[in-house]
Interface confidence: medium
């Protein structure tokens, strides 16, 4: 064999070493790549397991509070069982009292009637509260309400149906203040301010009575 | 949608009444008030009145009282405005509306007063 | 009853104009206001209720505003379909009172 021979072969042999050097290159990268891959995606489904594991948790406490709801529903539910009801059918409840809208226009003396009838007085309000509910519960009302509240005539004091005067800071009475009517002069509330107004004249009117707010 | 629909026109003579309906649809008729409102020819807006279809309760204004009745109908949604003792002053486009303020108006109803 | 007044009476403007009707009351009305819009031959057309409160389907260039007695109607640009006749209403109490209205024409 000769020199040139030789070199030949081993020039060969070096290109067949530097290519399956190559391919082992590509397929240690290729593995490296993989592996690369596959701990990123087990961190993927570590953190989706956590994250599901944190969801389940929010869910069970989630549930848990429901149940304790429930249980106070259900023992709320009792109480209220063996109590009846603050107000008759069709009456509002609001704070110790029970009101009823009137469906019918009568004047004063009328709709005192119908109140007493049902157990119950004409409106009167006692506070600032009362007022404001009675003024929020009228607000889209066009109607003027006749209250418990009237006189003789100006010279006497605005009277409540129980005889107590009216407290002068709860509010002022508008309109007719100074006439004199043969059936006396009547407080209505319209739009959220009082008016005095001719007992005779036919309104729609407010009656309230007591809220029953005792446990059987 | 909500509607008012009004009655025809009417020619009348002075000293006999008219009765106007205003048929009321799309929405819950009882729930609402209807608001009545006339205008005289080339002239502004009056209002004359209200009902409440719910419990059958009116106000009227001074003015008309003794001559106006407003009344309803809850089984056809219909509310009425009768207006008696005509004088030729009451010759107008009387309107229906809905309240909650006026949101929704009938298409009006001209009367006329004529002898 | 409360009377309303209405100033002015009528007025003269462009389109693109700003436009101020003012509604003063015989007192104070707790902003118990309304503003109607009418055209001929129809029936008048809710704008503002409770003085400030723009009714839904109306344009923004509408606008309401006051307090006690007097409020005011503001209409930012004016169109060519504002031109028309504009009412206040009270609803205070019983009766519910009309300002006499404000023509609004083109200039």
């Known amino acids: 064999m000769q020199l040139s021979q030789v070199s030949d072969l081993l020039t060969q042999e070096q290109a067949n070493l530097t290519h399956q050097k190559k391919k082992l290159e590509g397929q240690i990268s290729a593995r490296q790549q993989a592996e690369e891959a596959s701990q990123e995606s087990e961190n993927e489904l570590k953190e989706m397991i956590e994250t599901l594991a944190r969801k389940l948790n929010e869910k069970s406490k989630e549930q848990m509070e429901l149940h304790h709801q429930n249980l106070n529903l259900q023992e709320t539910l009792k109480r209220v069982a063996n109590c009846s009801a603050p107000c008759p059918q069709d009456w509002i409840w609001h704070g110790e009292n029970c009101y009823l809208f009137s469906s019918g226009s009568f004047n004063w003396e009328k709709s005192q009637e119908k109140c007493l009838s049902l157990d119950a007085k004409l409106l009167k309000i006692n506070s600032t509260a009362d007022l404001d509910f009675i003024q929020q519960a009228i607000s889209y009302s066009s109607f003027p309400f006749w209250m418990g509240l009237s006189r003789r005539n100006p010279s006497y004091p605005w009277l409540w149906e129980d005889g107590s005067p009216l407290m002068p800071h709860l509010f002022r009475v508008r309109g007719a203040v100074s006439q004199t009517y043969p059936s006396g002069t009547c407080a209505y509330i319209q739009r959220g301010a009082v008016y005095a107004e001719n007992c005779i004249l036919a309104a729609f009117s407010i009656c309230q009575k007591k809220a029953n707010l005792r446990a059987q | 949608q909500v509607q008012l629909v009004q009655s025809g026109a009417e020619v009348k003579k002075p000293g006999a009444s008219v009765k106007v309906s205003c048929k009321a649809s799309?929405?819950?008729?009882?729930?609402?008030?209807v608001h009545w409102v006339r205008q005289a020819p080339g002239q502004g807006l009056e209002w004359m009145g209200a009902?409440?279809?719910?419990?059958?309760?009116?106000a009227y204004v001074q003015k008309f009282q003794g001559r106006v009745t407003m009344t309803r109908d809850t089984s056809t949604s219909t509310a009425y405005m009768e207006l008696s003792s005509l004088r030729s002053d009451d010759t107008a486009v009387y309107y229906c509306?809905?309240?909650?303020?006026?949101?929704?108006w009938g298409q009006g109803t001209l009367v006329t007063v004529s002898s | 009853d409360i009377q309303m007044t209405q100033s002015p009476s009528s007025v003269s403007a462009s389109v693109g104009d700003r436009v101020t009707i003012t509604c003063r009351a015989s007192?104070?009305?707790?902003?118990?206001l309304v503003w109607y819009q009418q055209k001929p031959g129809k029936a008048p057309k809710l704008l503002i209720y409770?003085?400030?409160s723009l009714q839904s389907g109306v344009p923004s260039r509408f606008s309401g505003s006051g307090s006690g007695a007097d409020y005011t109607l503001t209409i930012s640009s004016l169109q060519p379909e504002d031109f028309a006749t504009y009412y206040c209403?009270?609803?205070?109490?019983?009766?519910?009172?009309f300002g006499q209205g404000t023509k609004l024409e083109i200039k």
């Open positions: 509306a809905r309240w909650l303020p006026m949101d929704y």
């Open positions: 009902i409440h279809p719910g419990s059958g309760g009116a």
């Open positions: 409770a003085a400030s």
């Open positions: 007192q104070g009305i707790n902003n118990w």
């Open positions: 209403q009270q609803y205070l109490i019983t009766p519910y009172t």
């Open positions: 799309g929405y819950t008729f009882t729930d609402y008030e």
